[in-house]
């Protein structure tokens, strides 16, 4: 169940977000989330994950990019980018994904 909290060993992560008590936190994994709200600059938040590990597998979009890692302070120097908005091409692309 992805909503259940992880009870494994905890890792120390860099914490830089409006939800941090201090500069580090302890969690099941470390996170970096880059979010762009409509009409605003993107904001990058670092912290700890304990629930919803499925978010780590999400693909980047033009609005959010979610990164997870599992080692000590592994989220400290990670920088994310958002998926660029692609204008519709005039002809179908031929390169497979």
């Amino acid at each position: 169940d992805p909503v259940k909290p992880s009870r494994g060993p905890l890792v120390t992560c860099t914490c830089e977000s409006p939800h941090c008590k201090g500069p580090t936190c302890r969690g099941a994994w470390c996170t970096v989330v880059l979010v762009r709200e409509e009409g605003r600059h993107p904001q990058e938040h670092r912290g700890c994950g304990n629930l919803h590990r499925e978010l780590c597998r999400g693909r980047p979009t033009e609005f959010v990019n979610h990164y997870c890692c599992d080692s000590h302070l592994c989220n400290h120097n990670v920088s994310l980018v958002l998926e660029a908005t692609q204008p519709p091409s005039e002809q179908p692309g031929t390169d497979g994904q």
Partner: antibody, heavy 113, light 110 residues
């Protein structure tokens, strides 16, 4: 859009009880720690209690520990504060807050005989 | 008496820069992040600064925060009449295992 809507406030006699609720919407409620903060009329902000994402960890200000109980129901996206043995000095606006950014508009609790 | 100490009042004229101080101890400001909230009359507090000096999306860059040791400050430049409000600092306190607030500073724009 993040929204927090408190309810359950009102007039209560000293020694009485109230249960406050905070309905959350616009975000994944189960991913965030939550708090209750209160503000007596004309006074400053006072932290009451907080609860972690799954409800397994709770912290209280000393003066309210034992009388107040914080809880949450993630399936209903709702935060609660059970307040017992209320005193006149508990009269305040009680705010529900997502730690540590968004706040609701508050619900007024008045304790008087 | 609040755990974090703030001046009860501050004032300035439009366009001026004003600074509000917040003093704590090693168990709160000294080891944890400082937050600043603005409370306009009759409304709920709004987050202005988190993580000592970071602004949430939508907060004007006229507002800035800083921290040194066990003290912090909020600076407001280019003061406007709509900045008239109560301002609160806050931090987590490791000794109390809870959130602590300053007593609030009432800012008047003259």
């Amino acid at each position: 859009e993040v929204q927090l809507l408190e309810s359950g406030g009102g007039l209560v006699q000293p020694g009485g009880s109230l249960r406050l609720s905070c309905a959350a919407s616009g975000f994944t409620f189960s991913s965030y720690a939550m708090s209750w903060v209160r503000q007596a009329p004309g006074k400053g902000l006072e932290w009451v209690a907080n609860i972690n994402q799954d409800g397994s960890e709770k912290n209280y200000v000393d003066s309210m520990r034992g009388r107040f109980t914080i809880s949450r129901d993630n399936s209903k996206n709702t935060l609660y504060l059970q307040m017992n043995s209320l005193r006149a000095e508990d009269t305040a606006v009680y705010y529900c807050a997502r730690e540590f950014d968004y706040w609701g508009q508050g619900t007024l609790v008045t304790v008087t005989s | 008496q609040s755990v974090l100490a703030q001046p009860p009042s501050a004032s300035g004229t439009p366009g001026q820069r004003v600074t509000i101080s917040c003093s704590g101890s090693s168990s709160n400001i000294g080891s944890n992040y400082v937050y600043w909230y603005q409370q306009l009359p009759g409304t709920a507090p709004k987050l202005l600064i988190y993580g000592n000096n970071k602004r949430p999306s939508g907060v004007p860059d006229r507002f800035s925060g800083s921290k040194s040791g066990t003290s912090a400050s909020l600076a407001i430049s280019g003061l406007r009449s709509e900045d008239e409000a109560d301002y609160y600092c806050a931090a987590w306190d490791d000794s109390l295992n809870g959130r602590v607030f300053g007593g609030g500073t009432k800012l008047t724009v003259l």
